[in-house]
């Protein structure tokens, strides 16, 4: 009996060795074989000269075999799909030079810290790359100049600071990008040049709102209905446009759309972002409608009908489980891993709408339910009680503050503490007069009639970081209708650099150790987001960000970063929007 | 011309076995892809099993385990060995080519009927 | 496995006239890679094995008149006899060639009324 099952699929000998326990390559392979499945296997280390006689292989996947090393000598040159995901390769090799023809390539789910300059030098067919949930810090500039035929790109789920300029040049076929999950404070100016991207993922990076952001902003200003909001397991083609989920880190979530860049200059290069301003007319070629048939439309003109049309089986998610024995050419549609915003964690606690007012009306409350991946804890479901509009009652919580020795939970040399010793500092906060239901702690005021007025937050000056990460400063705001979020200062003992706030790719679970004292009503802003113990240096918070056109609110995960030095800058603006237990 | 001869059929008991042969003819045998298919009586055609030109096998569920293909390039023959006979597996069995790498049948013999009764 | 539904499982025709079988399959045969849909036709005369008319949904076996043709794309597919001669009697097939285990359609019997 052989050790692997053989089908066929589409002209090619397909040879499915998958969870079959091997620790080295089956020697009764056949030698035709066009498709091998290796996935879930304990092969440790692979390289291509072990499969140099299979001159007729076109996809192999390699998934989940516990991979630290790859070495790519010998040529396939018939290879078309390398699925690499799910392993512990901690460098990738030049792989242009012995696998010319792929087309598809993920590296998704590794240790991946960074990339050399020429990765994917000869890499010319490359359609699809998947290199999100790795250690990417930062983008080796050029990196994608060979692979002009780009369709798919995914960075989700990684540790980008920055990304390189023109790092999107010359990829004219580019359909879908992924970037959220990252620590990006800014888009650089003319990033995306006047490449027609469909899809674009931005949201859960800690976007910093000052001048430099401008460009960025024009951008989604003027491509709302590309900016999409990523949903487990949904087809991209069935997802909802969502400009409103790329936020401000420092301004209290607003929408960076609707950043008003007040006294920035304007900019000739922030404005006219891809060299259009004279032709008016290409403009509105691009510019969406907000009703779904215009963007159905919109996307019949720019997804290629050969790997994407509705009746391909080619999907547009990146690839995460491993194909079906009888389907390997195709990719999959859900990404495990990727940083959500839930659909069903709402809060009915308007802090920003989407045009900068705060609505009159109380909204009903709603019963929240999370749905994480199974867990023992419960989650939290308990509707916030909303109070009469025209009171501004806050939360009535008597945090006790830490022993003077024990480390502050907000400042940055952060050590592992064990959750039952990590200290939580005091919120001075008033006890509201005219309701005795306490609510969290962001006010809702009620604007007056005239204008839209809401209260500025102030902005405490940390003391001097070694490591500042934004240098731009944050302008006191003067009294005008910008819309701002009142929030009481936050004391935190003895902080002496700037706290930090970074994304986190982990599902919801209560955390019960972190837990404030019974007297405080539960409500969905003291939901925490656990990392898996292998990951013990990292804060755990929620901040909320309401959904478009509504008052609900979806929660992103949060957390520290590994290292003290590399804290990204959390402005003080977000004191109030983290979960009790946070502080 | 191309020419496809089954031989080996006949009467056989359940749990028996049974080994059909194909004799190829007015081509290059080691060049294609060969499949054996069957047909019930009055029924329609079901593929029992194929071997490619570098002489891979591959079966359906029903057959596996019970049934094995192989070829004799240097005799221009393929072969069907059936272990563990059934009534179900009464049929007329048919050889047919493929072309190239494709799974299509471009040429079929003319058939050997297996009969499996007690 | 992959299911192939034909209709009609009969078909009375007059010479002359035209004909057309379909076949659905329970998943999509199209192979995005090429743009190819993987399904086959056959025809079985009476008391005489099954001779391939078409592959590849449209391509017509060499030998095979061109009053056969086929169409269709993804699940739907459609053999058409554009005029029925009587020599085209039998049973058709269609057959995907998309992924194993192969599978082929119930037949259609056409028969002169």
């Known amino acids: 009996q052989p050790t692997c099952d053989v089908s066929k699929v589409t002209s090619l000998l397909e040879v499915n060795c998958e969870d079959k326990k091997l620790k080295k390559l089956p020697t009764d392979l056949p030698a035709d074989t066009g498709i091998l499945h290796l996935s879930k296997n304990q092969l440790g280390t692979f390289s291509t000269s072990y499969l140099v006689h299979f001159t007729h292989l076109t996809h192999l996947y390699l998934s989940r075999c516990e991979l630290t090393s790859l070495q790519a000598h010998e040529k396939l040159l018939k290879l078309e799909t390398l699925d690499l995901s799910h392993n512990h390769l901690q460098s990738l090799p030049s792989l242009g030079r012995a696998l010319p023809a792929l087309t598809t390539l993920d590296v998704s789910f590794n240790k991946l810290g960074s990339l050399s300059p020429g990765a994917l030098e000869g890499l010319g067919q490359l359609e699809e790359l998947y290199l999100q949930n790795n250690d990417l810090k930062s983008l080796p500039p050029g990196l994608l100049m060979p692979t002009t035929k780009l369709l798919k790109l995914s960075l989700a789920n990684n540790k980008l600071r920055e990304l390189p300029p023109g790092l999107l040049d010359g990829l004219e076929d580019l359909d879908t990008l992924y970037l959220q999950g990252n620590w990006l404070s800014t888009i650089p100016k003319g990033f995306f040049g006047s490449l027609l991207l469909p899809f674009v993922f931005l949201h859960a990076n800690t976007w910093y709102c000052d001048c430099e952001i401008l460009y960025f902003r024009n951008w989604l200003q003027e491509n709302p209905n590309r900016v999409y909001l990523w949903k487990e397991g949904v087809d991209v083609k069935a997802m909802t446009a969502n400009v409103a989920s790329v936020r401000c880190a420092n301004l209290g979530n607003a929408p960076v759309y609707s950043y008003p860049g007040k006294g920035c200059p304007t900019n000739e290069g922030d404005i006219d972002y891809d060299d259009y301003a004279d032709t008016p007319t290409t403009r509105t070629e691009v510019k969406f409608s907000t009703n779904t048939k215009a963007h159905t439309t919109y996307w019949g003109l720019f997804y290629s009908e050969s790997s994407t049309s509705p009746d391909s089986q080619m999907t547009s998610l990146p690839p995460i489980h491993e194909p079906t024995k009888k389907q390997p050419t195709f990719a999959h549609t859900e990404i495990p891993g990727f940083t959500t915003l839930p659909d069903t964690m709402e809060s009915n606690t308007a802090f920003y709408s989407l045009n900068n007012t705060v609505p009159t009306t109380t909204p009903e409350p709603t019963s929240t339910q999370a749905t994480p991946e199974p867990s023992s804890t419960p989650m939290l479901t308990t509707p916030v009680p909303t109070p009469e509009p025209s009171s501004i009652p806050m939360l009535t919580v008597p945090v006790s503050t830490p022993e003077p020795s024990s480390t502050p939970m907000l400042t940055t040399p952060v050590s592992t503490p064990e959750p039952s010793s990590i200290p939580m500092p005091t919120i001075p906060v008033p006890t509201p007069e005219p309701s005795s239901i306490p609510m969290p702690t962001i006010p809702v005021p009620t604007p007056e009639p005239s204008s839209t007025p809401m209260p500025t937050i102030p902005v405490p000056t940390p003391e001097p970081s070694s490591t500042p990460m934004f240098t731009t400063p944050v302008p006191t705001p003067e009294p005008s209708s910008t819309p701002m979020l009142t929030t009481p200062t936050l004391t935190t003992p003895e902080s002496s650099s700037t706290p930090s706030i970074l994304v986190s790719t982990i599902p919801p679970v209560l955390t019960t150790t972190l837990a404030p004292p019974e007297s405080i009503p539960k409500t969905v802003l003291e939901q925490f987001y656990t990392l898996e113990p292998t990951l013990p240096r990292t804060l755990e918070s929620t901040i909320i960000i309401p959904e478009q056109n509504s008052l609900n609110s979806q929660a992103v995960p949060q957390a520290s970063s590994d290292t003290p030095k590399s804290n990204p800058f959390l402005n003080s603006d977000f004191c109030c929007l983290l979960p009790l237990g946070f502080y | 011309q191309v020419q496809l001869v089954e031989s080996g059929g006949g009467l056989v008991k359940p749990g028996g076995s049974l080994r059909l042969s194909c004799a190829a003819s007015?081509?290059?045998?080691?060049?294609?892809?060969m499949s054996w298919i069957r047909q019930a009586p009055g029924k329609g055609l079901e593929w029992v099993s194929s071997?490619?030109?570098?002489?891979?096998?591959y079966y359906p569920d029903s057959v596996l385990g019970r049934f094995t293909i192989s070829r004799d390039n240097a005799k221009n023959s393929l072969y069907l060995q059936m272990n563990s006979l059934r009534a179900e597996d009464t049929a007329v069995y048919y050889c047919?080519?493929?072309?190239?790498?494709?799974?299509?049948?471009?040429?079929w013999g003319q058939g050997t009927l297996v009969t499996v009764s007690s | 496995d992959i299911v192939m539904t034909q209709s009609p499982l009969s078909l009375p025709v007059t010479p002359g006239e035209p004909a057309s079988i379909s076949c659905k399959s329970s998943?999509?045969?199209?192979?995005?890679?090429?743009?190819?849909?993987?399904l086959a036709w056959y025809l079985q005369k009476p008391g005489q094995s099954p001779q391939l008319l078409i592959y590849?949904?449209?391509t017509r076996e060499s030998g095979v008149p061109d009053r056969f043709s086929g169409s269709g794309s993804g699940t739907d597919f459609t053999l058409k006899i554009s005029r029925v001669e009587a020599e085209d009697v039998g049973v058709y097939y269609c057959?995907?060639?998309?992924?194993?285990?192969?599978?082929f359609g119930q037949g259609t019997k056409v028969e002169i009324k």
């Open positions: 590849f949904t449209s």
């Open positions: 057959q995907q060639h998309y992924s194993s285990p192969w599978t």
């Open positions: 071997i490619t030109s570098a002489g891979t096998p």
């Open positions: 998943q999509s045969l199209l192979n995005s890679r090429n743009q190819k849909n993987y």
């Open positions: 047919a080519r493929s072309r190239g790498y494709e799974d299509y049948f471009d040429y």
């Open positions: 007015g081509f290059t045998f080691s060049s294609f892809a």
